[in-house]
């Protein structure tokens, strides 16, 4: 999912020494802010293809576009892993590949992409609108998961182009790693910007996007970098298996959820942003999540309607057990 930058365009400041200084002190933070938000933003793409020869056969291909090293890939169907989805395969770059029916063959295609062939008949057979999800655990980014399904009208043998799905699974490892440093930098830069409030403010060009957009500025990458705006969690649930994703019950939770830009999960107003994403409009549903680590062995409560925590299994020691090297 791509979106335009919400960084406002700056008009040239007044000439003179103070104007030059103001230009420098304002432009530099904005440039740094843009870099800060876009730097190292990984992306996961999912491609689902129905084989022409066997109508009950699917090929799922997933890839990770990021600089970190992948420590585990989990493929599930019927929803994200650990959120009602059923695990089909687990691929570790060194420890091996595990798969369960109807998965027939899981394999690494490259060091950052995998493929999975599914076949089945009867109860375990995937149907045309099943949602398939791929979760990549990587260091230092954390866990990133994307889901995809066949477009409703797709013909056998055809497939949707690989598309980055609008999903973020930022584990504590990633957040406290590079992301944490970048976030701190962003906050600091915003603080610098606020200090310049007393100076004559440059004229801002009106935003061409939704009224929500200004609130998401700090989270929006630049158009030039082509980085994806990753929502804490957004997926289309079109599974023919019983859908369990949208049954989150509010039980209260940590107050910092309020600061998450959950509005970013909603469909942008501009037509271009979703144009390349073959997501069926019917039966769609959006939920928001951020896969933070919980205490080892503990699964935190659901946090508000549509806000669900999906922790990785073994606490704050990132990438453990099947999640990778310890």
């Amino acid at each position: 999912m791509r979106t335009e930058a919400q960084v406002p365009a700056l008009q040239p400041p007044e000439p003179g020494l103070e104007g030059a200084m103001g230009h420098r002190t304002l432009v530099l933070p904005w440039v740094l802010l843009t870099l800060c938000v876009t730097a190292g933003t990984p992306e996961v793409w999912v491609q689902v293809r129905m084989e022409a020869t066997e109508l009950s056969s699917f090929t799922i291909r997933c890839g990770f576009l990021g600089s970190g090293s992948i420590s585990l890939v989990t493929v599930s169907w019927g929803g994200p892993n650990g959120a009602g989805g059923t695990t089909l395969a687990v691929l570790h770059p060194e420890r091996g590949i595990r798969q369960w029916a109807p998965a027939r063959q899981a394999r690494w295609e490259t060091q950052s992409s995998i493929s999975l062939i599914l076949e089945g008949s009867g109860a375990s057979s995937p149907c045309a609108n099943t949602t398939f999800c791929c979760k990549f655990a990587s260091f230092p980014e954390g866990s990133w998961e994307a889901c995809g399904s066949l477009p409703p009208s797709s013909d056998p043998g055809l497939s949707a182009p690989p598309t980055p799905a609008p999903i973020l699974r930022a584990d504590l490892a990633g957040i406290l790693g590079v992301s944490g440093v970048l976030l701190f930098g962003c906050v600091y830069l915003l603080h610098l910007l606020r200090r310049h409030k007393h100076r004559p403010a440059p004229r801002l060009q009106p935003s061409r996007t939704s009224p929500q957009a200004p609130r998401a500025r700090a989270w929006a990458p630049s158009q030039a970098s082509q980085a994806a705006l990753h929502v804490p969690y957004a997926t289309i649930n079109t599974s023919c298996r019983p859908a369990t994703l949208d049954t989150a019950h509010p039980h209260g939770g940590p107050s910092w959820w309020a600061s998450l830009p959950t509005h970013a999960a909603h469909r942008p107003q501009g037509p271009a942003a979703w144009a390349s994403t073959p997501i069926p409009a019917r039966g769609s549903f959006v939920s928001v999540e951020n896969g933070l680590y919980a205490q080892a062995g503990e699964r935190p409560p659901h946090t508000g309607p549509g806000l669900t925590l999906f922790p990785d299994p073994r606490g704050p020691r990132a990438m453990e057990g099947p999640l990778g090297v310890r």
């Epitope: 060091q111 699964r299 057990g321």
Partner: antibody, heavy 114, light 113 residues
Framework: QVQLQQPGAELVKAGASVKMSCKAS????????ITWVKQRPGQGLEWIGD????????NYNEKFKNKATLTVDTSSSTAYMQLSSLTSEDSALYYC???????WGQGTTLTVSS | DIVMTQSPSSLSVSAGEKVTMSCKSS????????????LAWYQQKTGQPPKLLIY???TRESGVPDRFTGSGSGTDFTLTISSVQAEDLAVYYC?????????FGAGTKLELK
Amino acid sequence: QVQLQQPGAELVKAGASVKMSCKASGYTFTSYWITWVKQRPGQGLEWIGDIYPGNDSPNYNEKFKNKATLTVDTSSSTAYMQLSSLTSEDSALYYCARGYYDYWGQGTTLTVSS
Amino acid sequence: DIVMTQSPSSLSVSAGEKVTMSCKSSQSLLNSGNQKNYLAWYQQKTGQPPKLLIYGASTRESGVPDRFTGSGSGTDFTLTISSVQAEDLAVYYCQNDHSYPHTFGAGTKLELK
């Protein structure tokens, strides 16, 4: 800490069935698969099969397909292996292991009596 | 099924000696997509469950002493103990982690001279 608890021993008559348990604790049971391994006295290890909690389609070694049935009970975080039509050949030590074999149970010694 | 063949079946060594044991697979354990070999080594002491030593043919499991080294690719693999200690006396198994069923070798028994 992570633990896989298995009963120490099972004594069963030939021709009968036995259901062995492997109770997991110290981690999120549904996030790791369980593998079962057989070891006859003084012999090597044989991979029986594995099962992922939440996925009702275990993998089996062809050799054990008509012998072993793997199941899980997520509510009690317990994995089970049922062995049917027992013979003396089934007398062995049976281990359960988690995920990529990072944790093992102490094993259940099955003795099939005639 | 992939057949794993270990040799020798037993080794008599003195403490401090360097030891190597072999494991051959009937099919390649190399994953062409990421160029990784899916082979694991286990150590089993009497009365204990096996303990994972090496995975990915050469990566030591955390907590495993660095005197244990795994090497090899494709179908030929080796486990080396640079300086055998008394606590290393055990049976060592290699395992195909590449495809189902995940077959084990028959083991190499390490004994003291």
